[in-house]
């Protein structure tokens, strides 16, 4: 790589940063950036609040949250004061007719009669054939099965009560959840009238009952958590300590660890090459060729032809060669990456508070999601409930004259219709009135608000951390020159001056994400379409948008670092960050990959460590522990293990995201430092001695030989 060529490349991406004698790290005297975007964002938030208030005023989430019987009366209120739970006669019809959108808009509504009951059924029961001719009183009332609709005569025939759907044909042991009776016991599936021949439904029901496996399971799970929550917390504490320890120890072991990891990857690739060669050789000797196979969509068939393994071998060999070449020719860059990782470890050690900033982000994200969810729920229930006539089997004798789907009054049920099972059921909410007519637009506004606020919160986190870590890098005398409260001051600074810039970056990302969501929705709708061209175009679009989102995230991240340091607006910061990175593209790629590798290993270490410890502890394989450390007796020991592993992953991700931000910030600062300074007395480098040593540079010593501490 010639120097002249390099200069030309650099100039294509702007001039290197000039020395600025006044620059002392994150600039103190700032002004507000992207004011227009800030105003726009604040107006949007104001609008979002207004939407929330309107939703709150017009909405009635009771309609979704509180159970209502078939007549539209709430359970647990008024005439049903002593009947707080809702029983679905055939809960499986809910499963067959429910999807996420209908639940979001209309609550859990099912095309089956619903009755308020004082307690949920405790035992499995099905109407026996010999009970069809008995009276409702004999079968239901005297057996304490008070689950029929109100007012069904005692001496009515059971079969006619079932035909009119006045009484349930089966009961499943249920537990109240969200005020509704949901099956929870592993019962043998009752022979359900009307659906015995429908295999898919029957299978679905069996599957559902299996998956709702048993009151015992629910109780056992609860017991297990009750017995092991303390130890789960201990496991999470271990995950926290391991994450911290890993990050803090990086300054000591980063070099050897990176080397071991790279060699490990080389080893894995080498084994892959060997394995592919062996498979290829065996198949070649057999003469198994792709020409014999012909075209097939069965991918597993390709495993049995030599060309597949040859192709895999070539790919792995190329990857191995590239990695070896990188190791040989870019070892200097790898050393810089290692030194930066060590530096990042030091920075985190100096500013431990940054490690817990993800909690702030988490809380803010939770607030955004909760606000959106509540607003969406209230909006969805802002219309007047509409009821229509409905019958489970419109082909029944007497139903032909009934106008199904015509509006009706739920308080005036068609009690004695000629059509069996005719009911006045909840259909949805009316779209009369300005709010109701604008409902779709308001929901879209809400979704936009959700994405924008979420992205803004994430941007805030990145910018705050960047500000804190930049103040570490640009402290000439470490730790003396580091501000007292770097995180808090970075937080205040970011909120005060850069809300607009963060909103701008978040908006760009939001628009791309919304486009992706729309594309996913279209793709979902076109699932049935078998047109390969359409599928291909859709795939290309999705791929392009995915790449665009990745790129914008990368650009935004670095723009926020520049904003945190220089306090310039989003566009200038993004341009500066981009050109700076492009001038050092090889370093960027190497650092990025080394960091990814290291953090992946870190996560693996933390999650694996906690997982192994949890496994040995909860499965009682660790012998000789004191009485205080005895593992609890559990029904399902995998439950706390899985909980611990998932918790450990979340914790590790939180910590390592901070560390990743730290590395990126220090890297950008390092590149700036290289371009801005030259090591002379008036332009000393701010980087650590180890980095200077790797680069073969040094700072001139002052005449009085007062060496600055590093």
């Amino acid at each position: 790589m010639g120097g002249k060529q390099r200069d030309k490349d650099d100039e294509a991406y702007g001039k290197p940063v000039k020395y600025d004698p006044s620059f002392r790290g994150p600039i103190k005297n700032r002004s507000c950036t992207d004011v227009i975007c800030c105003v726009l964002f604040l107006l949007f938030i104001l609008g979002y609040i207004v939407v929330g208030i309107v939703a709150w005023l017009y909405g009635d989430p009771r309609q979704v949250l509180y159970p209502r019987n078939s007549t539209g009366a709430y359970c647990g209120m008024g005439e049903n004061k002593d009947k707080p739970y809702l029983l679905y006669f055939n809960i499986f019809s809910c499963i067959l007719s429910t999807n996420i959108i209908s639940v979001a808009e209309n609550g859990l509504q099912c095309p089956t009669p619903q009755v308020c009951v004082s307690s949920c059924p405790e035992d499995p029961w099905t109407v026996g054939k010999n009970q069809f001719s008995q009276t409702v009183g004999e079968v239901f009332y005297t057996k304490n099965r008070n689950f029929c609709l109100p007012g069904v005569p005692w001496n009515m025939m059971v079969i006619t009560s079932l035909q009119q759907e006045l009484c349930p044909s089966f009961l499943l042991p249920s537990a109240p959840a969200l005020g509704r009776c949901f099956p929870w016991t592993n019962v043998t599936l009752p022979e359900l009238p009307g659906i015995t021949n429908d295999t898919t439904i029957a299978q679905g029901i069996s599957g559902l009952i299996d998956s709702l496996n048993a009151r015992d399971i629910s109780v056992k799970i609860f017991e297990d958590f009750a017995h092991s929550w303390y130890w789960i917390l201990v496991a999470l504490g271990v995950a926290l300590l391991l994450s911290l320890l890993f990050i803090l120890l990086l300054r000591l072991v980063a070099g050897p660890l990176v080397l071991v990891l790279i060699l490990g990857v080389l080893g894995v690739l080498a084994y892959g090459i060997y394995y592919c060669w062996e498979e290829y050789r065996v198949l070649r000797d057999k003469g198994a060729s792709i020409s014999q196979l012909g075209f097939t969509t069965n991918l597993s068939a390709y495993q049995s032809v030599q060309e597949t393994w040859l192709a895999a071998l070539i790919v792995l060999a190329v990857l191995e060669a590239i990695l070896l070449l990188v190791l040989i020719f870019l070892r200097q860059r790898i050393r810089i990456a290692i030194a930066l990782l060590k530096e990042a470890s030091k920075a985190v050690g100096q500013m431990m508070s940054t490690m817990f900033y993800p909690l702030v982000t988490f809380v803010l994200l939770l607030i955004c999601i909760a606000y959106w969810a509540m607003t969406a729920l209230y909006l969805a229930t802002s219309g007047q409930p509409q009821y229509v006539l409905w019958a489970s089997n419109i082909s029944s004798p007497g139903c032909e004259k009934v106008s199904i789907n015509t509006s009706c009054n739920p308080m005036d049920q068609p009690v004695n219709s000629s059509c069996p099972g005719l009911m006045c059921v909840f259909q949805g909410y009316s779209s009369k009135g300005l709010v109701q007519r604008s409902l779709f637009n308001l929901q879209i506004y809400g979704v936009l608000g959700l994405f924008w606020t979420l992205n803004w919160v994430l941007a805030l986190g990145q910018c705050v951390l960047a500000g804190a870590f930049a103040s570490f890098y640009w402290a000439f005398h470490k730790p003396q020159d580091i501000p007292t409260f770097p995180l808090i001051s970075a937080f205040i600074r970011t909120l005060r001056y850069h809300t607009g810039s963060l909103a701008f970056g978040a908006l760009i990302l939001t628009l791309v994400q919304i486009a992706r969501v729309i594309l996913e929705y279209i793709d979902h709708k076109l699932r049935g379409v078998q047109n390969p061209v359409a599928r291909c175009i859709m795939c290309c679009f999705k791929c392009c948008l995915w790449c665009l989102e990745k790129f914008i995230k990368f650009l935004n991240r670095n723009a926020y670092i520049m904003i945190a340091i220089y306090g310039k607006n989003f566009c200038v910061s993004a341009k500066n960050a981009f050109t700076l990175l492009m001038r050092n593209i090889v370093r960027v790629v190497v650092l990025d990959k080394v960091t990814d590798l290291l953090l992946f290993f870190g996560k693996l270490l933390v999650v694996g460590g906690v997982g192994v410890l949890s496994f040995f502890f909860f499965s009682g394989r660790i012998q000789g522990l004191g009485r205080d450390f005895k593992s609890p007796h559990l029904n399902y020991y995998w439950l706390p293990i899985m909980t611990s592993i998932m918790g450990a992953y979340v914790i590790a991700s939180g910590f390592f995201s901070v560390f990743g931000m730290c590395v990126d910030t220090l890297f950008l600062c390092f590149l700036e430092d290289l371009e801005r300074n030259d090591g002379s007395l008036d332009r000393p480098y701010y980087m650590s001695k180890s980095l200077l040593k790797i680069l073969g540079k040094k700072n001139e010593a002052p005449p009085d030989n007062k060496k600055r501490k590093k």
């Epitope: 054939k129 010999n130 069809f132 006619t160 004695n416």
Partner: antibody
Framework: QVQLVESGGGVVQPGRSLRLSCAAS????????MHWVRQAPGKGLEWVAV????????YYADSVKGRFTISRDNSKNTLYLQMNSLRAEDTAVYYC??????????????????WGQGTTVTVSS | DIQMTQSPSSLSASVGDRVTITCRAS??????LAWFQQKPGKAPKSLIY???SLHSGVPSKFSGGGSGTDFTLTISSLQPEDFATYYC?????????FGPGTKVDIK
């Protein structure tokens, strides 16, 4: 074809007993519920009793409850009505009728479809 | 018990007339109502079940309607063989009960 033939009617003194039979043919007797319906001279029809296909459930009109017993012998394809403590007001033509509900139609109940020709019971001293 | 009432108790009509008989239940019986035809000295014959469905072999001139408490039997074009007594019966609530009957005779 489906046929129901009643027998056992006659003249009987008040307080005495009588047993009516109904022989069924042309269908699977054991799968159907059966009714007894009576008609007093010059009057309308009055439902008396029902027995379901397996004999498990029996229901009676209030006027005969405790005095009449409906039963069936599926092996003989025969329906019975045992009438005890007969009264003058029990004088009527007694019909047996098949219920259209068989144990196989889960959700449809249609009531009676096929009737016998009837047997006359006269309660007189 | 459910009381069934029929009106009129008797009616005179000519061949070709359209005749409607009404049956009323003392409480709601949904559509569990049957209509029977009985000629003098003969056993009753089932015409209609579920308020409006014809038993097999019953001519389409007979039609039934209604639900709940009020029901009707209509003979669209009266023929000589249709002069008889017509009974309604509810069959959902024990004890099953018949209406008093409507006698249709020749004018």
């Amino acid at each position: 074809q489906v046929q129901l033939v009643e027998s056992g009617g006659g003249v009987v003194q008040p307080g005495r007993s009588l047993r009516l039979s109904c022989a069924a043919s042309g269908f699977t007797f054991s799968s159907y519920g059966m009714h007894w319906v009576r008609q007093a001279p010059g009057k309308g029809l009055e439902w008396v009793a029902v027995i379901w296909y397996d004999g498990s459930n029996k229901y009676y009109a209030d006027s005969v409850k405790g005095r009449f017993t409906i039963s069936r012998d599926n092996s003989k394809n025969t329906l019975y009505l045992q009438m005890n403590s007969l009264r003058a007001e029990d004088t009527a033509v007694y019909y047996c009728a098949r219920d259209r509900y068989s144990g196989y139609d889960y959700y449809y109940y249609y009531g009676m479809d096929v009737w016998g020709q009837g047997t006359t019971v006269t309660v007189s001293s | 018990d459910i009381q069934m009432t029929q009106s009129p108790s008797s009616l005179s009509a000519s061949v070709g007339d359209r005749v409607t008989i009404t049956c009323r239940a003392s409480q709601g019986i949904y559509n569990y109502l049957a209509w029977f035809q009985q000629k003098p000295g003969k056993a009753p014959k089932s015409l209609i079940y579920a308020a409006s469905s014809l038993h097999s072999g019953v001519p389409s001139k007979f039609s039934g309607g209604g639900s709940g408490t009020d029901f009707t039997l209509t003979i669209s074009s009266l023929q000589p063989e249709d002069f008889a007594t017509y009974y309604c019966q509810q069959y959902t609530i024990y004890p099953f009960t018949f209406g008093p009957g409507t006698k249709v005779d020749i004018k």
